[in-house]
């Protein structure tokens, strides 16, 4: 069903920013322990204009290697409702063109049997850190979409 | 539109220092990373530092001991602090905003610096 | 650093003309499925212009003539048909890895 402007972006409201607001509810707690760097990703990939659908389509795939590193399946369950609900609707809009394949995201550090806990943790505490900054930034670029606002 | 104008080029001696300003118009210049990029007379173009939306920075390391680069998003604008100055340094000092694919999408009209006794 | 090695660092061509420059990269420039090279046009005492970022994405505005292709360490950018406007100096960059580089530029000059 491709009603996302139709009625005032209801495909949106009702089921992605719904999403999006649990998760990031979910992870209220991070943010004060993100490191400053930036992630390699939000350098190359922006919501620009005219350049909406390209970003949404990249990081609804990121999104996906997400699945299954909480363990809790509502968590699990929300972020396949804003991958797929995102690739669906960027159909619907017209805003996405093909590409070539790609594999998911980006490719992951090696770990070793010697990797201790704290750099696991880490490892876990700088994907969470993406993860919400992924999902505000996927938030800000469709409500730019739906505003209609085409910011330079 | 988008506007980038920089500011505060000259001549200036070898081993002195200058700052080099870019002021922002046309977008939200917080939500972008910038980036100075330079041209010495007849050559080619030469990245020399980025920073980011939360502050981080990114250096070629040819120039990190000697250049730093900041922001004021309150003030819309980018610096570029260059110390101990060589003739070799003598260049259009452009700033460019972060565009997809960390291309350079869009870019001031340049400020050309001189290093020369 | 990636080495960015542009050819020819000259050409002579007529307005109509089907011109190609080619850029080759010291080590792939593919990651994720998008290739992470970028070209500029540059005219006398005028800054860059962006025409194709990601290897063949054409920036908004700029004409359909210009296009972008290759993989992991050839690109090259294409004019189909040569303008007036398009006698300039041409750079590829990559974005691939820090330090981002350039090549060292192509012009275009007519003939």
């Known amino acids: 069903d491709c009603d996302i402007e139709g009625k005032d972006g209801k495909q949106y409201e009702s089921v992605l920013m719904v999403s999006i607001d649990q998760l990031l509810d979910s992870m209220k707690e991070i943010g004060s322990n993100c490191l400053n760097n930036e992630f390699n990703f939000f350098k190359r990939h922006i919501c620009d204009a005219n350049k909406e659908g390209m970003f949404l389509f990249r990081a609804a795939r990121k999104l996906r290697q997400f699945l299954k590193m909480n363990s809790t399946g509502d968590f699990d369950l929300h972020l396949l409702k804003v991958s797929e609900g995102t690739t669906i609707l960027l159909n619907c809009t017209g805003q996405v063109k093909g590409r070539k394949p790609a594999a998911l995201g980006e490719a992951q550090p090696t770990k070793s049997l010697e990797e201790n806990k704290s750099l696991k943790e880490q490892k876990k505490l700088n994907d969470l850190c993406f993860l919400k900054r992924l999902l505000q930034e996927i938030k800000t670029c469709w409500n730019k979409i739906l505003m209609g606002t085409k910011e330079h | 539109q988008v506007q980038l104008v920089e500011s505060g080029g000259g001549v200036v001696q070898p081993g002195r220092s200058l700052r080099l300003s870019c002021a922002a118009s046309?977008?939200?210049?917080?939500?972008?990373?910038v980036h100075w990029v330079r041209q010495a007379p007849g050559k080619g173009l030469e990245w020399l530092a980025a920073?980011?939306?939360?502050?981080?920075?990114d250096y070629n390391s040819a120039f990190s001991s000697r250049f730093t680069i900041s922001r004021d998003n309150s003030k819309n604008t980018l610096y570029l602090q260059m110390n101990s100055l060589r003739a070799e340094d003598t260049a259009v000092y452009y700033c460019?905003?972060?565009?997809?694919?960390?291309?350079?999408?869009?870019w001031g009209q340049g400020t050309l610096v001189t290093v020369s006794s | 650093d990636i080495q960015m090695t542009q050819s020819p660092s000259s050409l002579s061509a007529s307005v109509g003309d089907r011109v190609t420059i080619t850029c080759k990269a010291s080590e792939s420039l593919d990651h994720d499925g998008d290739s992470y090279i970028n070209w500029y046009q540059q005219k006398p005492g005028k800054a860059p212009k962006l025409l194709i970022y990601?290897?063949?994405n054409v920036e908004f505005g700029v004409p359909a003539r210009f296009s972008g292709s290759g993989s992991g360490t050839d690109f090259t950018l294409t004019i189909s048909s040569l303008q007036p406007e398009d006698f300039a100096t041409y750079y590829c960059?990559?974005?691939?890895?820090?330090?981002?580089?350039f090549g060292g530029g192509t012009k275009v000059e007519i003939k």
């Open positions: 960059q990559q974005s691939n890895v820090d330090p981002l580089t």
């Open positions: 990601m290897g063949s």
């Open positions: 460019a905003r972060n565009g997809y694919g960390e291309s350079f999408a869009y």
């Open positions: 046309g977008f939200t210049f917080s939500s972008y990373g």
């Open positions: 920073i980011w939306t939360g502050g981080s920075t």
